[in-house]
Each structure stands twice: as structure tokens, then as C-alpha cells.
């Protein structure tokens, strides 16, 4: 089904429009930002693998404005946002957009600039304080040092806004100094360092699980006293809106 244009009169029923694609399914309150390195340190074929990883991750998230909101940004010497946190589109449409992110193949991919963009554009206003805020920084290159002058300031600024930064270093040219710096800023800023894009698939479930464990479950819906005893027969609501308490993943 094609997506209807979003307007104030469009009623978009989220959460029951698309069933989960995997057993592994994160049903938490989370704002998740994917930052994709658009430098020539990744070949076009490797960039396709990187995008496939992002799409695979998105398949394991309960994407909606109520649960997991996602943003996707490709960065080079600037930043190009393909998906914003407030974009009201079906998960399948968001995955399609993520799969069509263009390969820039630029000489430089500035982590400082994209973290600045994340700090001042994506998380300029915190409109969902109850949700966890996580930035997944997929980095395969090193920006020139002169561009990194304010790098730590941006990482600290994100920390002040309670944005967790998870760097994923890919390949031999990833900036390990910056990765270690990010880790040093907050205990939740766990890094994943991979030797190539081929390891992304192996690490995917661990990364999704780690992200999901950092996010809170939604509080149970509060019912008025006269409705407290009402029960609904099995299967009537389709996909459950609440995952089991014991684990971050809806199995």
C-alpha cells in the first residue's frame, strides 16, 4: 500500500499497520539517530553493506512516533538528513528511504560536523524527555585535525542533553582516538570496533540489544476505575503494544 500524504487531516494508525519482521524486536521508548560515514574510505559496495546494516537494524525496531523514532543522516564535510525523528511514515517506507541514501564518496567525512548537526539540529529541542536518545555513529575515516577542533565540545554537549553516543569504527582508517574520547565521556558510550563492513551483520544483534537495553519500557496504560476489569479476547488487537517486562526484546 502506498503512503498517503501526511496532512493535519490524515489519520495514520501506527503500531498495528505493520507486524514485526523478526522475533528479535525492540519495543521501547527510543529516539535513535543513524550517522553514516560518506567518505571514500568506504567503497560504493561497502557503503551498500553499511546501508543494509541500517535497514536490518530498523527491521528489528518498533518504529513509530510512539515507540522508536529514527533519523538517518549521511555525513561528509557537511551533513545530509534523509529521515528526521518526526517523519510520520510507515516503517517500510522509512526503510526504503534508508536503503536509497546516496553514496557521497567524499574526501572527508567530518565527525565533528555531524555531531554538531546532531546536537544543534536533531536534538535542539527535547520533545520526548521520557525516551532515551541514542546516536549510532558509523565511522570509517579520520577527519583532518583542524576540523576536529570542537569535537570534544560537541560530545560533551550531547552528554549534557543525555544523548548517548555509540561509535562503530569500521575498517583500518576509523579514528580510534575519537572513538576512545567518546567512550571516555560517559559509561553508556560503548564502542564497537570492526575490521570491516563484513562484521556488521555479525554484530547487529548485539548492537540492537545494547541500544534497546538503554531505553525505557513504556508505562502501562492507565485505565479509568470503571474500566479496570475489562478484558479483551486474544488476537483482537494484533501486535501487542507492550513487550514483556523481563526483557528488552519482544519475542
Amino acid at each position: 500500500p502506498t503512503d498517503a500524504p501526511v496532512s493535519p487531516t490524515t489519520l495514520y494508525v501506527e503500531d498495528i499497520s505493520e507486524p514485526p519482521l523478526h522475533d528479535f524486536y525492540c519495543s521501547r521508548l527510543l529516539d535513535l539517530v543513524f550517522l553514516l560515514d560518506g567518505s571514500s574510505r568506504l567503497s560504493e559496495a561497502e557503503f551498500e553493506v553499511l546501508k543494509a546494516f541500517v535497514v536490518d537494524m530498523m527491521e528489528r525496531l518498533r518504529i513509530s512516533q510512539k515507540w522508536v523514532r529514527v533519523a538517518v543522516v549521511e555525513y561528509h564535510d557537511g551533513s545530509h538528513a534523509y529521515i528526521g525523528l518526526k517523519d510520520r511514515k510507515r516503517p517500510s517506507e522509512l526503510r526504503r528511504i534508508a536503503s536509497q541514501v546516496k553514496y557521497a564518496g567524499s574526501q572527508v567525512a567530518s565527525t565533528s560536523e555531524v555531531l554538531k548537526y546532531t546536537l544543534f539540529q536533531i536534538f535542539s529541542k527535547i520533545d520526548r524527555p521520557e525516551a532515551s536518545r541514542i546516536t549510532l555513529l558509523l565511522m570509517a575515516s579520520q577527519e583532518p585535525q583542524r576540523m576536529s577542533r570542537n569535537f570534544v565540545r560537541y560530545v560533551q554537549g550531547l552528554k549534557k542533553k543525555k544523548v548517548i553516543v555509540i561509535p562503530v569504527g569500521i575498517g583500518p582508517h576509523a579514528n580510534l582516538k575519537q572513538i576512545r574520547l567518546i567512550e571516555k565521556q560517559a559509561p553508556e558510550n560503548k564502542a564497537f570496533v570492526l575490521s570491516s563492513v563484513d562484521e556488521l551483520e555479525q554484530q547487529r544483534d548485539e548492537i540492537v540489544s545494547y541500544l534497546c537495553d538503554l531505553a525505557p519500557e513504556a508505562p502501562p496504560p492507565t485505565l479509568p476505575p470503571d474500566m479496570a476489569q475489562v478484558t479483551v479476547g486474544p488476537g483482537l488487537l494484533g501486535v501487542s503494544t507492550l513487550g514483556p517486562k523481563r526483557n528488552s526484546m519482544v519475542l
Epitope: P144, Q145, R146, R149, R153, K177, R180, L181
Partner: antibody
């Protein structure tokens, strides 16, 4: 220990270019940045620009069009070149170590050379 | 560019005195401020970085404080070797800029 030593021409004619060499010891130019600062006679300090460990550069925008900073890591030397000199470029020129790095963001100029005096006069 | 204004421009004090030099920035510099000492022979040394952190080898009688646009350097017990000109410098934004200097003399 950390040392920086500038060597320059002393006297330069107006409209000519200035070349100063800074030779360093006690640290590697791949690990630290080097800045250039000047001080006209009886006046304050003015930051000119810097070269980072990876060779990337930053310049004072007021001087950028006539300034160039380069280096030779193997010789532990940093070079300042300034074109189209005028009399108000007369100053003592200092090269200074800068611990600027991905891991450092307190850009303090921590060790200074003794400076070399340059007079622009015909 | 960020303008840095130091006061006073010159100062006469007695040995053992407590001396304070002020530095004001034209905009908030978020504590990104250093202090330097220049001896009469032209030799320059870093004293304090990031407003209040003492550089290695600098005597503890030197201290720095401040925030926003207003900063100060204090010498708690003036010694003969402290006779020099003192400069503040901001590193909030390029280009780095220095104050005009404060020349410290002994009465």
C-alpha cells in the same frame, strides 16, 4: 626537553616576502601542532596561524591571503612564509608548541621559542 | 573576532602583595581562557590554561578564575621574578585573540 628556535632574515624590504624556519626538539611534529604568534615593538601579541600534527592548517582570516605554514616532519622544522610585507609587519615572530590533538581540546600554547625579530624597511 | 580587554594596563605593587589582573571578553568564552607571562627579555611562558588549571612547573601562588565574559589572574604573594607583562588569550573561537597586556612593576 622541549625547545623551539626561530631563524629569520632580520631585515626585509617592503613588498618582499618573509620566510622563517622553526626548528623543534624534544617532541615530534606528528604529535603536536605548532602556532605562529607575532608582537610588533611595544605592542601586544597577535596569533597568525597554526599547523596541526596531520599537516592541516588554520590561519588568522585577516592574514590568510598572504600567509602559508608548512612543515617537514623528518627534519623537525616548521616554515612560515608571508608575502607582500609592509612596515606594519615589523615584529618579533614566535613559533609555539600547541598540544592540539583529537584527544586534547585545551588549546594552550605551552612552549614558546625565543622569537626572531623582523624589520620591514627599505 | 572576539575582543579581549585587560585591566589595568600597568600595575605597581610591593613584594609580598596580592595582585589581581582582570580580563574581559566581548562575548561568552565558556572558560576557554589561558594566561601567559612575558619577561622583559621577551621570553613567554604559559601560566594557566582553561581559566584555572596551573601549567606544570608554575608556582602555586598563581591562580585563575572566572566564567562567561569576566576572568582574572591572581598572584597571591608577589616575588621579584614575577615582574613581567601578563596576557590573557581566548580559544573559544578562531582566530585566537590576546588581551593588550598588563605590565607589572615593583614599587
Amino acid at each position: 626537553q622541549v625547545q623551539l628556535k626561530e631563524s629569520g632574515p632580520g631585515l626585509v624590504a617592503p613588498s618582499q616576502s618573509l620566510s622563517i624556519t622553526c626548528t623543534v626538539s624534544g617532541f615530534s611534529l606528528t604529535d603536536y601542532g605548532v602556532d605562529w604568534v607575532r608582537q610588533p615593538p611595544g605592542k601586544g601579541l597577535e596569533w597568525l596561524g597554526m599547523i596541526w600534527g596531520d599537516g592541516s592548517t588554520d590561519y588568522n582570516s585577516a592574514l590568510k591571503s598572504r600567509l602559508s605554514i608548512t612543515k617537514d616532519n623528518s627534519k623537525s622544522q616548521v616554515f612560515l612564509k608571508m608575502n607582500s610585507l609592509q612596515t606594519d609587519d615589523t615584529a618579533r615572530y614566535y613559533c609555539v608548541r600547541d598540544p592540539a590533538d583529537y584527544g586534547n581540546y585545551d588549546y594552550a600554547l605551552d612552549y614558546w621559542g625565543q622569537g626572531t625579530s623582523v624589520t620591514v624597511s627599505s | 573576532d572576539i575582543q579581549m580587554t585587560q585591566s589595568p594596563s600597568s600595575l605597581s605593587a610591593s613584594l609580598g602583595d596580592r595582585v589581581t589582573i582582570s580580563c574581559s571578553a566581548s562575548q561568552d568564552i565558556n572558560k576557554y581562557l589561558n594566561w601567559y607571562q612575558q619577561k622583559p627579555d621577551g621570553a613567554v611562558k604559559l601560566l594557566i590554561f582553561y581559566t584555572s588549571s596551573l601549567h606544570s612547573g608554575v608556582p602555586s601562588r598563581f591562580s585563575g578564575s572566572g566564567s562567561g565574559t569576566d576572568y582574572s589572574l591572581t598572584i597571591s604573594n608577589l616575588e621579584p621574578e614575577d615582574i613581567a607583562t601578563y596576557y590573557c588569550q581566548q580559544y573559544e573561537k578562531l582566530p585566537w585573540t590576546f588581551g593588550g597586556g598588563t605590565k607589572l612593576e615593583v614599587k
